[in-house]
Amino acid sequence: QPSVSPGEPSPPSIHPGKSDLIVRVGDEIRLLCTDPGFVKWTFEILDETNENKQNEWITEKAEATNTGKYTCTNKHGLSNSIYVFVRDPAKLFLVDRSLYGKEDNDTLVRCPLTDPEVTNYSLKGCQGKPLPKDLRFIPDPKAGIMIKSVKRAYHRLCLHCSVDQEGKSVLSEKFILKVRPAFKAVPVVSVSKASYLLREGEEFTVTCTIKDVSSSVYSTWKRENSQTKLQEKYNSWHHGDFNYERQATLTISSARVNDSGVFMCYANNTFGSANVTTTLEVVDKGFINIFPMINTTVFVNDGENVDLIVEYEAFPKPEHQQWIYMNRTFTDKWEDYPKSENESNIRYVSELHLTRLKGTEGGTYTFLVSNSDVNAAIAFNVYVNTKPEILTYDRLVNGMLQCVAAGFPEPTIDWYFCPGTEQRCSASVLPVDVQTLNSSGPPFGKLVVQSSIDSSAFKHNGTVECKAYNDVGKTSAYFNFAFKGNNKEQIHPHTLFTP
């Protein structure tokens, strides 16, 4: 029995004075606790606890289930114990079949013995199957068998406690080990959509998927820079033993503009944390914003092609798109498509393909687009550059030579005189009058220029050239005349187009 210094309280003493006692089933258990300040006896085995306020614990006919630790405690809280084995050949093991182990930790298979004097108290696999080679265990007849450092691979392992008797194994009831996995990585989190655009009053619903090895992963939706608790609903599944999935759905039934912001799905386990965000933008009404991809004033040469391209943002989705020219709608020659296939896409492209444009096809080309909330339009002013065309070249009754040319950009008319039969008309003649005439055609059409010179200035036979030109090209017309005495012959005009 323990010895203590005088004056100090001492633990109680127990008779019989040994740490372990073995009795046969049916025999009496008689334990005496001696202490001036006796308080109680306590009996413990597995999860069972009994108390007795008498200083002598007597069990007249011992049963296997009386196997366990008997502790006597005094008023100072000091105690002494004796472990009693009740030997019962019919019941070698006391068992608590619940068996949970945390990965990498030890776990106890609770099968204490009723007789410590047995051989090879150990673990065996069910139905003769071998145990995993790396499964290490420590036998303790009073407590059971401790499995060291539980592995995930031991999950659902079926085993028995075993002892050898007369060359045969005696097995306990079976145990099924359930392994609680350790977190060895942060949770995997993903969100149904990275961004949401809604109109006021529409429902906002976003789902976060959390994946981990077990359901003890923590997760929550948070609003950035806010402590407000958000309403979320959960669904969860176990896909196999260590593959857990939870879906946390956040819903705002009628979103307001001030609900706009960043929402974070946060998850953590004992290893660490992970998060993913989604952005909500709530607008009071829909919108359309159009961005021309080329200049809205377009210059194109006669016979060439041009593509009018716009990008536009539309929310909600665009419902009607059209290209218009001269109050007529194009039924073909244009295409409209989303800028990306992303579910959140609000950006679109529209292209009008104008081919082999004629001088008469300049003008305003308008793109119109609408959705359920708004309409929007953008106009392109298309100018077709054409080589000058000489419309008229005449000698007027007042003796003037007149040349009228049309083209775009506005043609310039120069006059030249060629004496005699010379081909090259180099001597320039200044016009008397130059006018830009209003075209009767549509705007953006050809510009008409009229230029006149006084033919009385010419005293010799020769040719007069009217040359109309612009950035695109040039065209000439010629007036031939000759003197007969003092009289001028009738002038014969002809043209020569110079490419």
Partner: nanobody
Framework: QVQLVESGGGLVQAGDSLRLSCAVS????????MAWLRQAPGKEREFVAA????????YYQDPVKGRFTISRDKAKNTVYLQMNTLKPEDTATYIC????????????????????WGQGTQVTVSS
């Protein structure tokens, strides 16, 4: 300081019996496992048998099950290994050890973390 002294080794014929003794002195090893291990020349040390000093539970490695018996006499502070039907492959130095930690591996192999060791006694089994 705990001392373990082995005795009882010798040269025997195959099929004979031998009893080894391990005398414990220095202190009582009430919560200890007392074990016999053996080491043959050029081989690793292997567990043979063990007994819990106070509880009397016993543990045997497969090759000796049914042939060897471990026991203890608390009054004499001695552990015994009774070896019957000896085979030439039992030839080795037999070592007595005391340790608080006995463990099983995969259900068939026992091992002990020895805190105290004897010098060993030689057993030779001739065919």
């Amino acid at each position: 300081q705990v001392q373990l002294v082995e005795s009882g080794g010798g040269l025997v014929q195959a099929g004979d019996s031998l009893r080894l003794s391990c005398a414990v002195s220095g202190r009582t090893l009430s919560n200890y496992f007392m074990a016999w291990l053996r080491q043959a020349p050029g081989k690793e040390r292997e567990f043979v048998a063990a007994i819990h000093w106070s509880l009397g539970s016993t543990y045997y490695q497969d090759p000796v099950k049914g042939r060897f018996t471990i026991s203890r006499d608390k009054a004499k502070n001695t552990v015994y290994l009774q070896m019957n039907t000896l085979k030439p492959e039992d030839t080795a130095t037999y070592i007595c050890a005391a340790g608080q930690h006995l463990s099983g591996l995969g259900g068939s192999a026992w091992s002990i973390e020895g805190d105290y060791w004897g010098q060993g006694t030689q057993v030779t089994v001739s065919s």
